[in-house]
């Protein structure tokens, strides 16, 4: 069937519309378009003869129409008057006619709307505001936006006049927002510019800051007042009821006790005509003196002396406070406070007691801190350490040893070789050493203040031949699946290569084996019983090589789940029951038995002569390894039958 489709159906003024023809018959002579719902020669727009491809305008032709060979009609620059029906008249070659009607609607392109308001400065909780969207346009829909969101649901918001007017009743400061209106019709949508609603409000009750109401004599008083208000409030200050100044801030330098009193801030809004006040009471206290700390011993000796720190001056009815390292006092038996907290005593001082220490005097409104005091604790010297840690050197190299001991004041150092004093320096340097430089090297550290001395002796061997190495271990009895073991090849020697063997083989590749410290240390992580092997380390340089004696790792493991033998579980009455329990374990485990939950004997073998059906039950073997701290057990059910009642039963032992 012949049909007409309007594309688009809703057309904007000034745009184009295409009346598209569907199902056009074959073998046509021509066709004609008419304005309206019927064929009317006076309302013919255009005709088209297919044979000549000639378009002929009719009485209703406006110069804006184009007819296509497929009978579709394009109308340009649409005007409001074009709205309505259009009829296509098709003339077939057999001169039989066919008609179809289509239609479209024309809408204006909407202008950009604007918002008018009946009240540009409404007062909070008093006024209403009516916004109207201009201009009034036929067939247009009106929408409103607040802060680019659709209108919230509120009993104070009312739409009227076909949604063209938005009324806000009893405006509040929260209605201060961006308002936009939008006009829509089927062909266009336009949004207005924002209108910001300026709601007059306040002043609210002012707030005075800071909230602090207690001050010390000599301080500056700086009060600030703020009240929510639109337009911003005008402020006035009153002290004890007397007007001071019309400012938002009140500043009084170097206050005295006489400045105590009631301070009032008044906020005024000239547009709303409202006033609000807030009062705060200020108290000014006399200034106490700044405390300081005295000490009965300025250079105490570690582990020997006590120190008493006293907070000065002494003031009656005053609370004294103490801080160490900017923290309140820790609980310690070495710290003692006097009854009035004024004196802090440190019993048997250590090097960690240096401080700083502060004391404080608490008054009505604050705490006054003393300057910090640091204790000069004399300590040491500790046992000196000689570095580097090498004990073996080759001839011809330089020997450079350094000594250090923790000490206050810093230690004075002396070096001795084989008991003979060499020099009073922290470092000892001997160039181009020979075998004759082998010997005992002693570093002596002396603290002149405490009078204490400490020494460390190191054996230095100078030899072209490497010594026989030895293996030291950090764990002689590691527990399986728990401990790690670090083997170290001694001694530490310069320019030396370290090698390792396990059971006479080079080290296997394993994620549990790790070499470190220039291959001098071999670490076994998460040891297993299979790691109980012979470990040998070797050292070599360009002229010699040597191997250590083997060290066998004693891995503690188990006990594993025990096994009860024999495996039989059925016995004849009168037989002997002889059960043996075994569990893999290092060291060997302790064994115990329970029959039907009742403890029996602490042996590996359980023997019961001439059993009867009364010996039926559960037989449990418990194993315990005191070294690993682990336990294990197994349960076996034993059935004893009366003689001759059941074939195939064990005769027992």
């Amino acid at each position: 069937k012949l049909t007409i489709e309007s594309t688009p159906f809703n057309v904007a003024e000034g745009k184009e519309v295409l009346l598209l023809v569907h199902n056009l018959p074959q073998h046509l002579f021509g066709y004609s378009w008419y304005k309206g719902e019927r064929v009317d020669g006076n309302r013919q727009i255009i005709g088209y003869v297919i044979g000549t491809q000639q378009a002929t305008p009719g009485p209703a032709y406006s110069g804006r129409e184009i007819i296509y060979p497929n009978a579709s009609l394009l109308i340009q620059n649409i005007i409001q008057n074009d709205t309505g029906f259009y009829t296509l008249h098709v003339i077939k070659s057999d001169l039989v006619n066919e008609e179809a009607t289509g239609q479209f609607r024309v809408y204006p392109e909407l202008p950009k709307p604007s918002i008018s308001s009946n009240n540009s400065k409404p007062v909070e909780d008093k006024d209403a505001v009516a916004f109207t969207c201009e201009p009034e346009t036929q067939d247009a829909t009106y929408l409103w936006w607040v802060n680019n969101q659709s209108l919230p649901v509120s009993p104070r918001l009312q739409l009227s006049n076909g949604n063209r007017t938005l009324t806000l009743f009893n405006v509040t400061r929260n209605d201060t927002a961006s308002y936009k209106c939008e006009t829509q019709n089927p062909v266009s949508a336009r949004r207005s510019d924002s209108v910001i609603l300026n709601v007059l409000y306040g002043p609210d009750a002012p707030t005075i800051s800071p909230l602090n109401t207690s001050y010390r004599s000599g301080e500056n008083l700086n009060l600030s007042c703020h009240a929510a208000s639109n337009p911003p409030a005008q402020y006035s200050w009153f002290v004890n009821g007397t007007f001071q100044q019309s400012t938002q801030e009140l500043f009084i330098p170097n206050i005295t006790v006489n400045n105590s009193g009631s301070y009032t801030c008044q906020a005024h809004n000239s547009d709303t005509g409202l006033n609000r006040t807030t009062v705060t009471t200020i108290t000014v206290y006399a200034e106490p003196p700044k405390p300081f700390i005295t000490s009965n011993n300025s250079n105490p000796v570690e582990d020997e002396d006590a120190v008493a720190l006293t907070c000065e001056p002494e003031i009656q009815n005053t609370t004294y406070l103490w801080w160490v390292n900017n923290q309140s006092l820790p609980v310690s038996p070495r710290l003692q406070l006097s009854n009035d907290n004024r004196t802090l005593t440190l019993l048997s001082v250590t090097r960690n007691d240096v401080g700083p220490y502060e004391c404080g005097i608490q008054n009505e409104l604050s705490v006054d801190h003393s300057d910090p005091v640091i204790l000069n604790v004399l300590y040491g010297p500790d046992d000196p350490t000689i570095s580097p840690s090498y004990t073996y050197y080759r001839p011809g190299v330089n020997l450079s040893l350094s000594c250090h001991a923790a000490s206050n004041p810093p230690a004075q150092y002396s070096w001795l070789i084989d008991g003979n004093i060499q020099q009073h320096t922290q470092e000892l340097f001997i160039s181009n050493i020979t075998e004759k430089n082998s010997g005992l090297y002693t570093c002596q550290a002396n603290n002149s203040a405490s009078g204490h001395s400490r020494t460390t002796v190191k054996t230095i061997t100078v030899s072209a031949e490497l010594p026989k190495p030895s293996i030291s271990s950090n764990n002689s009895k590691p527990v399986e699946d728990k401990d790690a073991v670090a083997f170290t090849c001694e001694p530490e020697a310069q320019n030396t290569t370290y090698l390792w063997w396990v059971n006479g083989q080079s080290l296997p590749v394993s994620p549990r084996l790790q070499l470190s410290n220039g291959n001098r240390t071999l670490t076994l992580f998460n040891v297993t019983r299979n790691d109980a092997r012979a470990y040998v380390c070797g050292i070599q340089n360009s002229v010699s090589a040597n191997r250590s004696d083997p060290v066998t790792l004693d891995v503690l493991y188990g006990p594993d789940t025990p096994i009860i033998s024999p495996p039989d579980s059925s016995y004849l009455s009168g037989a002997n029951l002889n059960l043996s329990c075994h569990s893999a374990s290092n060291p060997s485990p302790q064994y115990s038995w329970r029959i039907n939950g009742i403890p029996q004997q602490h042996t590996q073998v359980l023997f019961i002569a001439k059993i009867t059906p009364n010996n039926n039950g559960t037989y449990a073997c418990f194993v315990s390894n005191l070294a690993t701290g682990r336990n294990n057990s197994i349960v076996k059910s034993i059935t004893v039958s009366a003689s001759g009642t059941s074939p195939g039963l064990s005769a027992g032992a």
Partner: nanobody, 119 residues
């Protein structure tokens, strides 16, 4: 009655210029698109230029771009085609037509005016 009357054709040497006029009656050219169509023997009809006053734009066939200029005087309800740098291949009968603003289609009327480019 709707009428389109073309004028301004004639004989011109290659490289020369001509100005064609299209006087419209029975409708306002400011409401539609006016185009110039040319027909030459053995060649396809070609819409060489169109002007849509109500849309504010003009368009040209690639073959005449930079040489032809279409314009309209709405007070006289007349459209013009200024033809410069004419070539022998521009020889044709030029018709004034109602053109589509959305494609290359048109309906034409009138007698047309002949343009001959020859030395």
């Amino acid at each position: 009655e709707v009428q389109l009357v073309e004028s301004g054709g004639g004989l011109v040497q290659p490289g020369g210029s001509l100005r064609l006029s299209c006087a419209a009656s029975g409708f306002n050219i400011k409401d539609t698109c006016i185009g110039w169509v040319r027909r030459a023997p053995g060649k396809e009809e070609e819409l060489v230029a169109a002007i849509c006053e109500y849309k504010g734009y003009t368009r040209y066939a690639d073959s005449v771009k930079g040489r032809f200029t279409i314009s309209a005087d709405t007070s006289k309800n007349t459209a013009y085609l200024q033809m410069n740098s004419l070539r022998a291949e521009d020889t044709a009968v030029y018709y004034c037509a109602i053109a589509s603003p959305v494609d290359q289609y048109y309906n034409y009327w009138g007698q047309g005016t002949t343009v001959t480019v020859s030395s």
